[in-house]
């Protein structure tokens, strides 16, 4: 999946299986990523588990779990708030669109989480105070999580180089540039660009991610995934100047 | 192995405060150099761990992306106090403890928020 970290780094990760997205003293978020096509390096999120840890007189421990085709509007115990404690309503789940869009507000830690199902896969977005992000007691066992650290270098796909390659080579030679076996129904480059331009007129990294996803999978739902990811940034990011992220100018392999 | 403290200090030095080190300022390079120094100091105890190698590669990557020189000033991380976690023996009838912004306003103007997102393939 594409990852935008707490430090506004933008990466495309091929991490497979269960990985920690957030792990601090208040909250643990784990995602499970699966290949989008058999044998593909590109992966997307198929499962999401959020554990809100027991906190003073505010909330009991609550677990939220979403999977492909199952986006509940409740915690696994069936409740929609933080339990029986005095401040239980400081943790609340709201269903925005049935089966497609859920918002979780954890006011006791100043945190808002948005989970969506777009097509077959899940998207995740969070707004969290710096203090909470940094509330890690044991840096050895916590702290190595994707939102803070990004994904390991050997788990990253250089999708910007892929994008440039695709632009220069045309659809026929895309398979060689692709990190995955070409999807049965992939778009020609021009079609992918047009579809992404419709939803994402600004040619930022969300737009580029959209093009990458369409070329890699042929699944038009990934256009919506990028679109909603940007919408969530607009709602959740505190620095309105950093809504759009752009490709940094740098030398790409094979270019003068 | 304290490499993740280095990560946190770098994150803290470069993310939304009153004067954040934006990606294209000398402050950002200074923060990167501090990160590199911190990372180097953990080499003995972290060199076999993934976190260390990720940090080293990440620093090299960012240094070249931002044309930062290896030599130059370094920055000091901003210190933060953490809100209390876990079960507390002190009970309070005030709901303020369960409202981060209200309890935060007591000791600081406004919290600095940050964002993380995951989507697509």
């Amino acid at each position: 999946p594409h990852l935008r970290t707490f430090t506004d780094r933008f990466q495309t990760c091929k991490v497979q299986g269960a990985w920690p997205l957030i792990d601090n003293n208040y909250l643990n978020v784990q995602v499970t990523n699966t290949p989008v096509l058999p044998g593909s390096a590109a992966t997307a999120t198929s499962k999401l588990t959020i554990i809100f840890k027991n906190f003073q007189e505010c909330v009991d421990q609550k677990v939220y779990q979403a999977e492909m085709d199952e986006l509940p509007a409740a915690f696994v115990d069936g409740s929609k708030n933080g339990g029986d404690k005095h401040g239980a309503n400081s943790l609340k789940i709201t269903e925005k669109v049935s089966g497609q869009h859920v918002e979780i507000q954890a006011k006791y830690i100043g945190t808002t989480i948005v989970v969506r199902q777009v097509g077959r896969y899940l998207t995740f977005a969070v707004r969290m105070p710096e203090e909470v992000v940094n509330a890690v007691e044991d840096w050895d066992s916590q702290g190595l999580y994707l939102c803070l650290r990004g994904c390991p270098l050997n788990q990253q796909i250089d999708f910007q180089a892929f994008h440039t390659n695709a632009e220069g080579t045309g659809a026929r030679r895309l398979a060689a540039a692709s990190p995955a076996p070409t999807a049965p129904e992939t778009f020609p480059y021009e079609t992918a660009v047009a579809k992404c331009k419709e939803k994402l007129p600004v040619e930022d990294l969300y737009y580029q991610a959209c093009v990458f996803d369409l070329l890699t999978t042929g699944d038009v739902n990934f256009t919506l995934a990028a679109y909603y990811a940007l919408e969530d940034v607009k709602m959740l990011h505190s620095n309105k100047d950093k809504l759009h992220l752009y490709e940094r100018t740098r030398d790409l392999p094979g270019r003068a | 192995c304290k490499i993740l403290k280095c990560n946190s200090e770098f994150w803290s030095a470069t993310s939304g405060s009153h004067a954040p080190a934006s990606d294209d300022t000398p402050e950002f390079c200074a923060a990167l150099r501090s990160y590199a120094l911190c990372t180097r100091r953990t080499a003995r105890t972290c060199r076999g761990d993934l976190a260390y190698h990720s940090a080293v590669h990440g620093i090299e990557d960012l240094m070249s992306q931002h044309n930062c020189s290896k030599d130059g000033p370094t920055s000091q991380p901003r210190l933060r106090t953490l809100p209390p976690a876990g079960d507390s023996q002190e009970r309070s009838d005030s709901p303020e403890i369960c409202h981060y912004e209200k309890s935060f306003h007591k000791h600081s103007a406004t919290p600095n928020y940050t964002h993380c997102g995951l989507f697509g393939d």
Epitope: - | C1, L37, R44, T45, G48, D49, A51, H53
Partner: antibody, heavy 115, light 112 residues
């Protein structure tokens, strides 16, 4: 909870070989360097060697260099110690330990080299 | 190789009383950056070693605050402010600054 369980110890003749295993759980094994350390009966601790998280580097004590090989299988969360050309002085309890510098240790497995 | 010499090798202590173990290094354990990578381990009878202190003075998670470490350069000390019955065992210092990593020969703490 971090758990390390060593196995594969036993009685072996001088000059013989043995392969020890260390099954790890409770932490992300593939993120950490790992160590082997041994303790001869009634004696102190001796560091044998360590392996990086991705097996890219291995370091050994002089006393075992060329005879012992550390390896790992991250997909199985398992660390190995292949011991060849064993000597009587290799008789010890062998521990695996997590981290570039050992923080959590297993319970150990006994290796006896004797004819 | 760096040689770590512990003293005393045997330390009988009365319950509730303090205890102190010394560890001397054959060369300085301070790096050029000013860090010192010396650790202390406890091995209770019949058990595996357990990390107590790292980087001279930092207690590992779960270690009681009656344990403290100090020192610099070549001289280091582990102190137990009030010895309890569960503290019986062998204590090892361990240096990480230089390759190969080496242990002290151990100090056996017993109750008088």
């Amino acid at each position: 909870e971090v758990q390390l369980v060593e196995s594969g110890g036993g009685l072996v003749q001088p000059g013989g070989s043995l392969r020890l295993s260390c099954a790890a759980s409770g932490f992300t094994f593939s993120n950490y360097g790992m160590n082997w350390i041994r303790q001869a009966p009634g004696k102190g601790l001796e560091w044998i060697g360590m392996i990086y998280y991705d097996s890219s580097e291995k370091h050994y004590a002089d006393s075992v260099k060329g005879r012992f090989t550390i390896s790992r299988d991250n997909s199985k969360n398992t660390l190995y110690l292949q011991m060849n050309s064993l000597r009587a002085e290799d008789t010890a309890v062998y521990y695996c330990a997590k981290g570039t510098t050992p923080d959590y240790w297993g319970q150990g497995t006994m290796v006896t080299v004797s004819s | 190789d760096v040689v770590l010499t512990q003293s005393p090798l045997s330390l009988p202590v009365t319950l509730g009383q303090p205890a102190s173990i010394s560890c001397r290094s054959s060369q300085s354990l301070e790096t050029s950056d000013g860090d010192t990578f010396l650790e202390w381990f406890q091995q209770r009878p019949g058990q595996s070693p357990r990390l107590l202190i790292y980087e001279v003075s930092t207690r590992f998670s779960g270690v009681p605050d009656r344990f403290s470490g100090s020192g610099s350069g070549t001289d280091f000390t582990l102190k137990i402010s009030r010895v309890e019955a569960e503290d019986v065992g062998v204590y090892y210092c361990f240096q990480v600054t230089h390759d190969p990593m080496t242990f002290g020969q151990g100090t056996k703490l017993e109750i008088k």
